[in-house]
């Protein structure tokens, strides 16, 4: 069992050109806080994983209100050392997320809100007992400086908290073959007792007591060669007549990982993958509770009140996340209907409706063409909004009463001529130029461009536009 | 502005399931989260539960093994089960709407007053 | 859960007067995740302060919230008439949420 520490020194914008703009503005004072994040082993891992070696949250640090015109200094930080519990071996090698986080303390409705400043993550190597290690880490135009260790809690010692200490038997030294436990001098270590006769070579032992077996060795005492080359079934009992002899039941029998976590086996013994808000070699450790106050922006925090049970975030509408840290852009669902309009405003969506659609989400369509006419021939389009009229040819306007001169646009390109024809407009082009609305050249070969004339049409012939 | 309104039996028999639903208007149920409190006659308000238009709910885990509470977007109402209702259920039931910025009520209904005999 | 005790039980003050009511958490009520309310006679509890000590919409500042942690405060710096009601408070950090029993303040 042990600690694992780390201490904050600096945040602030890194070197070079692109400083960051101050987080914290006179309008928008705030404050930070930071949350580191365990791993075992080197994996490359999603930041959302389970911290399986345990999280923590620090305090939070002093209002910071950035001076105008200022570059953004280092920001004040939360005073102490974020700690991590572990309560099994330190593995020597872990993977770490450091997470900065800026609480804002404004106006803004619904008191503090959070967001995420920037996120470091690496994988080290690191033997507990040893001295400080100093890290400098950048996000973005951030840079992040801390220090970190890994101590162990008596009566544990060692790189990995693992060897005891006792207090010495005799004032002056330690028992045969037993060292001082640095750096408890006046302690000695305590051997791990395996079980008896349990080989050195090839069994362990973490508990007292116990012999676990390397691999390719089983028996009891872990002194028996394991054989594959003639093995048909991965497990069972030993097969008198091939001389094979198979491990018996596997260290994940029975899952040995508690909370839901689930077991792999590994070459030494076995790994459990803990769900969200547990840690340890069994899962038996929750890293956060609802105590710690984990979620963010309005968030409540639903179960985990105490070490063996996970929490939950209820987010508020506008925000999602295991923290409820991250905010949604409620209207990237297209909530409203019809091509409505949608306005997050807060506390609430709104949808601004097109003309002939209604309904909190623009679901109604109203009944466009109820008692509504069109003149002259034409019919009422339902559906479209404002009720629509689709006009006869020759009429035009909202509804169809107005007599329609197919000309007045213009329509005719390249200096064309404009005829109003019963069946809609005809396009006398300038010469060089020919289509339904002399938009195209003809070439001075002779040959046009897209598309070639209809057959028996010359460039520059008056061209119906049907 | 958000209005709620309570509706359901005033007087439920020992051991029945008290029904009661709340009617949503001047905004959409898919906005928020809604919730039921209730008050015993002289006593300390009490937060049954709530639910979300998604379905999530949370219930009080006194009342948990109890109560039900579900929503009706087509309707803008929610509603409440409790069964197995004693005469301690006695309470003036409010529903109430969870404000967007956390987890307390900003709208109430006006109150039903429910017996238990 | 978190259990909140408001005290005093009653209170008898007289309009134009200052008070001030308590609300004390058994555990830290963290982000200052606490609301107080407003209860007259014979109606539904309204919304004064979230947040701790921000005003809810259409509250007059006469009213106003503190603290942290675990002791939070409401204020009412001049009392009115219409002031003589049954106030409660609210943690909504955690699951279950859960209310005071109330101060009663009563004219004098």
């Known amino acids: 069992a042990g600690v694992f520490e780390l201490q904050i020194h600096s945040f602030g914008p890194g070197p070079g050109p692109g400083a960051p703009r101050s987080p914290c503005s006179a309008r928008l004072p705030c404050r930070l806080f930071f949350r580191v994040c365990l791993k075992p082993g080197l994996s490359e891992e999603a930041a959302e994983s389970p911290c399986a070696l345990g999280a923590a949250l620090s305090a939070r640090g002093p209002v910071y209100t950035e001076q105008p015109g200022a570059p953004a200094p280092d920001l004040p930080l939360p005073d102490g050392l974020l700690q991590v519990p572990f309560r099994d071996a330190w593995p020597g090698t872990f993977s770490f997320i450091i997470e900065t986080w800026r609480e804002e303390l404004g106006d803004q409705i619904g008191g503090p809100a959070w967001s995420l400043l920037a996120r470091v993550a690496g994988r080290r190597r690191l033997a507990a007992g040893g001295p400080w290690a100093r890290d400098i880490q950048r996000a973005g135009a951030w840079e992040l400086r801390f220090s970190y260790r890994a101590r162990c809690e008596p009566p544990a010692v060692g790189t990995a908290c693992t060897r005891l200490c006792r207090p010495r038997s005799a004032p002056s030294r330690c028992g045969p073959g037993l060292r001082p436990c640095a750096p408890l001098e006046d302690e000695c270590e305590a051997p791990l007792v395996c079980r008896a006769g349990c080989s050195p070579e090839h069994g362990f032992c973490e508990q007292p007591g116990e012999c676990r077996c390397l691999e390719g060795w089983t028996g009891p005492l872990c002194t028996v060669p394991v054989s594959t080359s003639s093995c048909l079934s991965p497990r069972g009992p030993s097969s008198a007549t091939t001389g094979c002899l198979v491990p018996g039941p596997g260290p994940c029998d029975g899952n040995p990982c508690a909370n839901g976590g689930s077991c792999s086996e590994t070459p030494r013994s076995f790994e459990c993958t803990c769900p969200r808000g547990f840690y340890g070699l069994r899962c038996e450790v929750s890293g956060v509770t609802c105590a710690d106050g984990p979620c963010f922006n309005g968030g409540l925090c639903v179960g985990g009140a105490d070490p063996d049970s996970a929490y939950i975030c209820h987010c508020p509408p506008g925000f999602q996340g295991s923290n409820c840290e991250k905010r949604v852009d409620r209207c990237s669902l297209q909530p409203c209907r019809n091509g409505g309009l949608c306005l997050d405003l807060g506390h609430a969506l709104r949808c601004r409706c097109r003309a002939g659609f209604a309904g909190p989400r623009c679901e109604h369509d109203l009944d466009d063409c109820a008692g509504r006419a069109c003149a002259n021939g034409g019919t009422c389009v339902e559906g479209g909004g404002a009720h629509r009229c689709s006009c006869a040819l020759g009429f035009g306007g909202r509804d169809c009463r107005e007599r329609a001169d197919p000309c007045a646009a213009r329509p005719c390109a390249h200096g064309g001529r404009c005829y109003a024809h019963f069946s809609g407009l005809v396009c006398a082009c300038a010469p060089g130029y020919m289509g339904a609305r002399c938009e195209f050249p003809v070439h001075p070969d002779g040959a046009s461009a897209l598309p070639a004339a209809p057959p028996g049409l010359r460039p520059g012939d008056p061209q119906r536009y049907l | 502005q958000v209005q709620l309104q309570e509706s359901g039996p005033g007087l439920v028999k020992p051991s029945e399931t008290l029904s009661l639903t709340c009617t949503v208007s001047?905004?959409?149920?898919?906005?928020?989260?809604w919730s039921w409190i209730r008050q015993p006659p002289g006593k300390c308000l009490e937060w049954i539960g709530y639910?979300?238009?998604?379905?999530?709910?949370n219930y009080n885990p006194s009342l948990k093994s109890r109560v039900t509470i579900s929503v009706d977007t087509s309707k803008n109402q929610f509603s409440l089960k409790l069964s197995s209702v004693t005469a301690a259920d006695t309470a003036v039931y409010y529903c109430?709407?969870?404000?967007?910025?956390?987890?307390?009520?900003?709208?109430w209904g006006q109150g039903t007053l429910v017996t238990v005999s | 859960e978190i259990v909140l005790t408001q005290s005093p039980g009653t209170l008898s003050l007289s309009p134009g007067e200052r008070v001030t009511l308590s609300c004390r958490a058994s555990?830290?009520?963290?982000?200052?995740?606490l609301a107080w309310y407003q209860q007259r006679p014979g109606q539904a509890p309204r919304l004064l302060i979230y947040?701790?000590?921000s005003r809810a919409t259409g509250i007059p500042d006469r009213f106003s919230g503190s603290g942290s942690g675990t002791d939070f405060t409401l204020t009412i710096s001049r009392l009115e008439p219409e002031d003589f009601a049954v106030y409660y408070c609210?943690?909504?950090?955690?699951?279950?949420?859960?209310f005071g029993c109330g101060t009663k303040l009563e004219i004098k």
């Open positions: 109430a709407s969870i404000a967007v910025t956390g987890f307390y009520f900003d709208y």
């Open positions: 001047g905004g959409s149920i898919s906005s928020y989260y």
């Open positions: 639910v979300y238009y998604s379905g999530t709910t």
């Open positions: 555990q830290r009520v963290n982000n200052n995740y």
């Open positions: 947040g701790a000590s």
């Open positions: 609210q943690q909504y950090d955690r699951s279950p949420l859960t």
